[in-house]
Structures are given as C-alpha cells and as structure tokens.
Interface confidence: medium
C-alpha cells in the first residue's frame, strides 16, 4: 500500500491490542498505546490498544483513575505489553479532577471505522453492527 501524496508523518507506534475492539488482531498502530481496566456489571474488563489520533489519547490519558476506570498510556513500540492498569486503592481520592466515566464507553474496531479507533458511548454501540 502506497501513500498517494505528501502528507503528515504521524510517527506511529505498534501496540498490543486485547479486547473486543481488536477483532481478530493482536496489535494496532497509533500515536499512543494504552492499557485499561474498567468495572462492567461487577466484572473487571481489561483492554489494550491504541489511540490513532493523538488529541483523543491525550484527553483520555490525562484522566486520573476513578473507582470504575483506569487507563495507562505510553509511547513506544509495544510499550503497553507489560502494563496492567490498576484501579485506585480504596480511600484514595483525586480532589479537583473531573473523571470521565469511561466504563460507559467502548472502543469500536479499527476495521469498522476505516482505520481509526474512537471512543463511543454505550448508546451508540446499540446501533452499530458488531462482528
């Protein structure tokens, strides 16, 4: 596959991909890698993947852990391989921060979005065909 014209050189990293969003792939390419843990209906849901758009990752990665969601991000090929996100220990609070409730969000597969992974709401997911 060859790029048609001069364009931005996005400096992509190879990331480990694990979870529903990955389809049959075990890796993805993005400007940041992540490892996340969320509580869904009482279950621990671990995911790994990549943010293809830097701004999207920046926002999510700066979000401090909440009791229901933790995301750890890194930059470097396969840098999320040995990272396991951890929820904050009980009693630890993060004053003055606005937590995104990412446990209500999921990642659609890169394939479905034509090569771009995006965070979308649970509501949107109901109207989206999954493999």
């Amino acid at each position: 596959m060859e790029d048609e014209k001069p364009k931005v050189n996005p400096k992509l990293y190879m990331c480990v991909c694990e979870g529903l969003s990955c389809g049959n792939e075990d890796h993805c390419e993005g400007q940041q890698c992540f490892s996340s843990l969320s509580i869904n209906d009482g279950f621990h849901v671990y995911q790994k993947g990549c943010f293809q758009v830097y701004e999207q990752g920046k926002m999510t990665c700066k979000t401090p852990p909440s009791p229901g969601q933790a995301v750890e991000c890194c930059q470097g090929d396969w840098c999320n391989r040995n990272i396991t996100a951890q929820l904050p220990t009980k009693g630890k609070s993060f004053p003055g921060t606005q937590n995104f409730h990412l446990e209500e969000q999921k990642l659609i597969s890169e394939e479905d979005l034509g090569g771009e992974q995006k965070l979308i709401s649970e509501e949107d997911l109901h109207h989206h065909h999954h493999h």
Epitope: N9, Y13, E55, D77
Partner: antibody, heavy 122, light 112 residues
C-alpha cells in the same frame, strides 16, 4: 552491534534497471521501519523511500515515485530498492538507514550503512 | 514539499572557537503530536552521515555535549561550543514532520 551493508550498486545505462540490497544484522529487523537515502557526488542528502517494519506501508520521494519500489524480506533481514527507468540524475551513493521504530520515519536515522554507488551513464 | 534552507554554506572556524549553523523551513514543523521533528546530522569526508540531534535539541547517544540544538517554528540552530578537529565536514538539518522527508543543502565546517 547493529550493522547495515548495502550491495547491488553498479554502472547502468539510462533507462536500465538495478536492484539494491541492504543486509541488516544486530537488531530485530521486522520491528523497525527502514529508509533509503541517496547522495549524488559532491551534493547533499536526499531521502528516497521508506517502508514500515511489516512491509505494509511504503513512502516515496517525488523523484522515486513510479520508478522505484522499496520492499523487504523480514525472514532474511534484507531491505531492497528496485530501480527502473534509471536516469543520469539517479547517479549517487545509496544509503540504507534504520529508523526509530516500526512505523517511524526520519528524526532518528541511525545507523547508516556505508552506501553503494549507482552510476547511470551511457 | 517542505524546503529546508541552511546558512552559511561554508563556515571556516578556529579550533576551540564556537560555530553556529542556521536552518530555516518553508513551513512550521510542529507535528500533530505536538513535537517538532527537526534533526541535525554530521558527515565527515568519505563517511556516511551520523545523527547528532533529534527533535530540535535532544543529543543522540554518544554525541559530545559541545553540540546543542535550539529553535522553534521555522527557525533552528545548531551550535558547537568549541570546535575540535574531528568536527570538520558537512552538517545537514532534516525535517521528518511531513512526507517527503527533506534535508537542508548542507553547511561545510572547516578549520581556518
């Protein structure tokens, strides 16, 4: 120690073809993008083409597009540059360069091979 | 394509004295990730180039601290605090923010 050794440079007539090779050692070849950079005699540096570690994405300069094809054989740790429709202005030393990461181009060109000389002349 | 313009073309310097090379890009080099991908390379006569500085000011592994890079936007500078005999040769700036990657025309550093 990371090593890159280019070969395949030769004297070729205008309109002719040549295939350059770069044998890599000392690192996990498939984990890194690679590029070809050339330098005409007594002139500056010109980036020619790049390829991701898995070989899926390729990029070319305006002068190389349509005439040159970059490829790699990760099982043999070898990078290639197939050059067709060669012109006098393609005469240069061609360097093979290791990139910073799998899909990372420029910014961190290290190391460079010693280069192979391509001369296009009748 | 982004055009990289280096000045001066040639810089005769005295051993132990400072030297400065300028590089100007035809457009800003800030990438979508916020970083500026401007590198400096050094090429001694008869040798392949070697990387000195990446992302404007980061010295590459093994590069002496007499080399420093600075700048922002479209204007960048490489400084050698005290020139040594081994520093002769050509210096090139290079942008890798946009394809195709492009180099400056080079600056020749020679001893007076």
């Amino acid at each position: 120690e990371v090593q890159l050794v280019e070969s395949g440079g030769n004297l070729v007539q205008p309109g002719g073809s040549l295939r350059l090779s770069c044998a890599a050692s000392g690192f996990t070849f498939s984990n890194y993008a690679m590029s070809w950079v050339r330098q005409a005699p007594g002139k500056g540096l010109e980036w020619v083409s790049g390829i991701t570690g898995n070989g899926i994405k390729t990029y070319y300069s305006v002068s190389a597009k349509g005439r040159f094809t970059i490829s790699r054989d990760n099982s043999k740790n070898t990078l290639f540059l197939q050059m067709n429709s060669l012109r006098a202005e393609d005469t240069a030393i061609y360097y093979c360069v290791k990139e910073r990461g799998h899909s990372w181009f420029g910014d961190w060109f290290d190391p460079w091979g010693q280069g192979t000389l391509v001369t296009v002349s009748s | 394509d982004i055009v990289m313009t280096q000045t001066p073309l040639s810089s005769p310097v005295t051993l132990g004295q400072p030297a400065s090379i300028s590089c100007r890009s035809s457009q800003g080099l800030v990438n979508s990730d916020g970083n500026t991908y401007l590198s400096w390379l050094h090429q001694r006569p008869g040798q392949p180039p070697r990387l000195l500085i990446y992302e404007i000011s980061n010295r590459f592994s093994g590069v002496p601290d007499r080399f420093s890079g600075s700048g922002a936007g479209t204007d960048f500078t490489l400084k050698i605090s005290r020139v040594e005999a081994e520093d002769v040769g050509f210096y090139y700036c290079m942008q890798s923010t946009q394809f195709p990657l492009t180099f400056g025309g080079g600056t020749k550093v020679e001893i007076k």
